[in-house]
Each structure stands twice: as structure tokens, then as C-alpha cells.
């Protein structure tokens, strides 16, 4: 039994640098305890954004000084990672793991490529 | 960089019980799944345990289940097999290893401690 | 349980040839390693996710396979690869190994 992780394939970041997914997984177990780890690969280098875990029904719980915010309903997790510049543009990775009860399962999804762009500064302004 | 060192091992009888240490150094052991890998003399490979990340969660294999017990003291970043009611079966080397970023590959292994159960 | 099943048990090669080893499951496999064990060493990890190659491993090692059926190939075997290899399924506990496929000098 596979676990299936569905995930977009493209997010722009707004001008703020926040960026939005959702992540979804297709469990084939009854698990209670859901573990959300979001990996950011580029330049075939891969770094830990934020890692979550959290009781179904229950709210995910970050760390207090992660980027990364987010809600569950069901099988879908909405993931919000802010403080994002331009040379975070990478491929954001959503891999979950089914850790209780067993047995566990793994799934990683294909990744959802973020793109942000730095905003332009403004323009000092005559008065 | 990333370092696993197995002791604890040693011969013991039958029904006794033997407490295993994996001392990590180069990364903290909070982050990532660790578990124990046996090989009886001779033979394959056989996954033993897992504790993840927290701690508060351990699976284990089928045949050690209510024998072992896995615990970690965060402080000496040291990982403890506690193996009670131990059979001639458990004899093997136990290798202490780390599991990957992509997932429970193994990627770093200890050098193994042999734990011999014999009367 | 998913159970993995190498072969073939032992491979006899030359210095120099291709060695084509196999692992095939019992159920369906989402992620899968290869491993390299030699006599009196703990095992080393060659490959993961059935295709990526590990930190510092060459590039004569390569993997593949999806489903049921994996395969490791070493492309021109070097003296230091003659050792046992084992595959092993990762995507669900228990976290099961193949029996091991020793590739030894002919």
C-alpha cells in the first residue's frame, strides 16, 4: 500500500514573500498522528523549511520561530511559508509521514516549484 | 561530521536482559527517525526498531515487540536499546543507524556491538 | 509484510564486467535503497528513492526500477566492490531487507 502525495506544481509568491499550497495525501491507514515535513531542494542541495506533527482533527503546530504556518482538514494540509526573497525560489517538497498508529507510512510529493520575486523599491517621491 | 558509536554488547544468558548505547555526535538525534538494525552471524539484514524524531513514537519488529525498548536522552544525544528476556535467536551484531531526509534508508550506521545469547 | 527477494543468490564476475543484480517485492514498492556490506563492516548506503546515488558514492552505481522489480548495476565492477548487496523497501514498517546477492571474484 502506497501513500500518494498530491501537491501543485507551481506557486508564485505574493509581493509580501507568502506563498501558499495545499499538500494532500491519499492515507491507507486509520492514522491518528500525521507528521508534515516540508524539504526545499535546489541546486541538488536539500534543507529542512519546517516540520510539523499533529493529531487528526487538531490544528498542525510549528515550532514558535518557523516560517511555515498551516491548517488540516482530513487528508489536506493548507502549508503558508512566509519571510520568503527571491533566493528562496527553489522546489518545496511535501513529504508525510503517518507515524501512529502502525503501521507507518511514507509519501513524498512531487514538489511545487515557488517562485518569488524581490519587489521593486519604491520610488522616493518630490513634494 | 556524522558519527555513530554502538557498545553495551557482550554474552549473556538466556532470559537476561542487556541495555545497548549509540552515542550520535555531528547532528541532533530530535531530528531525525533512528533505529537498530541486527545481522545474526552469517545471515541478512533485519530491521529491529525505530523511535522518531520527538520520542514519543516507537515501532518495532514483530519479533522483539514487548522485549525491547527504545528510550534517547536528548542531553548526551544518545540513543539506549534496553533488550529484556533475551533468546538464543537475538544474537547477532546490532548496528545503530540513521534514517535519511527522503525518508528510512539508512543513511549512516554505527560499527555495530555483537550481543552474544548463550548459556 | 513486504518481502523482497534478491537475486540471484551469487554472481560470479571478472574485474572490469557489468553486474546486473535484481530485487523483486511481493507487493507493490514506493521507495526502495540499495546497500553494500563488506566482511566485518556495518552495510553502506549506495542508493535510495531506487534511482538517486548517496553522498560519495561513483557513478558506476547506478539503480532502477518502479513496482515490484528493482535493479542494481554496477558498470564496470573495480576490485572494492566484490562484497554481499542488499535492497531494502522503505515506504512502509515493518522496514523490510532482501536476503543479499554476494557478488564475488570469478
Known amino acids: 500500500k502506497a501513500m500518494h502525495v498530491a501537491q501543485p506544481a507551481v506557486v508564485l509568491a505574493s509581493s509580501r514573500g507568502i506563498a501558499s499550497f495545499v499538500c494532500e495525501y491519499a492515507s491507507p491507514g486509520k492514522a491518528t498522528e500525521v507528521r508534515v515535513t516540508v524539504l526545499r531542494q535546489a541546486d541538488s542541495q536539500v534543507t529542512e523549511v519546517c516540520a510539523a506533527t499533529y493529531m487528526m482533527g487538531n490544528e498542525l503546530t510549528f515550532l514558535d520561530d518557523s516560517i511555515c504556518t498551516g491548517t488540516s482538514s482530513g487528508n489536506q494540509v493548507n502549508l503558508t511559508i512566509q519571510g520568503l526573497r527571491a533566493m528562496d525560489t527553489g522546489l518545496y517538497i511535501c513529504k508525510v509521514e503517518l507515524m501512529y498508529p502502525p503501521p507507518y507510512y511514507l509519501g513524498i510529493g512531487n514538489g511545487t516549484q515557488i517562485y518569488v520575486i524581490d519587489p521593486e523599491p519604491c520610488p522616493d517621491s518630490d513634494f | 561530521q556524522v558519527q555513530l558509536v554502538e557498545s553495551g554488547g557482550g554474552v549473556v544468558q538466556p532470559g537476561r536482559s542487556l541495555r545497548l548505547s549509540c552515542a550520535a555526535s555531528g547532528f541532533t538525534l530530535s531530528n531525525y527517525g533512528m533505529h537498530w538494525v541486527r545481522q545474526a552471524p552469517g545471515k541478512g539484514l533485519e530491521w529491529v526498531a525505530v523511535i522518531w524524531y520527538d520520542g514519543r513514537n516507537k515501532h518495532y519488529a514483530d519479533s522483539v515487540e514487548g522485549r525491547f525498548t527504545l528510550s534517547r536522552d536528548n542531553s548526551k544525544n544518545t540513543l539506549y536499546l534496553q533488550m529484556n528476556s533475551l533468546r538464543a535467536e537475538d544474537t547477532a551484531v546490532y548496528y545503530c543507524?540513521?534514517?535519511?531526509?527522503?525518508?528510512?534508508?539508512?543513511?549512516?550506521w554505527g560499527q555495530g556491538t555483537l550481543v552474544t545469547v548463550s548459556s | 509484510e513486504i518481502v523482497l527477494t534478491q537475486s540471484p543468490g551469487t554472481l560470479s564476475l571478472s574485474p572490469g564486467e557489468r553486474a546486473t543484480l535484481s530485487c523483486r517485492a511481493s507487493?507493490?514498492?514506493?521507495?526502495l535503497a540499495w546497500y553494500q556490506q563488506k566482511p566485518g563492516q556495518a552495510p553502506r548506503l549506495l542508493i535510495y528513492g531506487a534511482s538517486s546515488r548517496a553522498t560519495g558514492i561513483p557513478d558506476r552505481f547506478s539503480g532502477s526500477g518502479s513496482g515490484t522489480d528493482f535493479t542494481l548495476t554496477i558498470s564496470r565492477l573495480e576490485p572494492e566492490d566484490f562484497a554481499v548487496y542488499y535492497c531494502?523497501?522503505?515506504?512502509?514498517?515493518?522496514?523490510?531487507f532482501g536476503q543479499g546477492t554476494k557478488v564475488e571474484i570469478k
Open positions: 507487493q507493490s514498492v514506493s521507495y
Open positions: 531494502q523497501q522503505y515506504g512502509s514498517s515493518p522496514w523490510t
Open positions: 543507524a540513521r534514517g535519511g531526509v527522503w525518508g528510512s534508508y539508512f543513511d549512516y
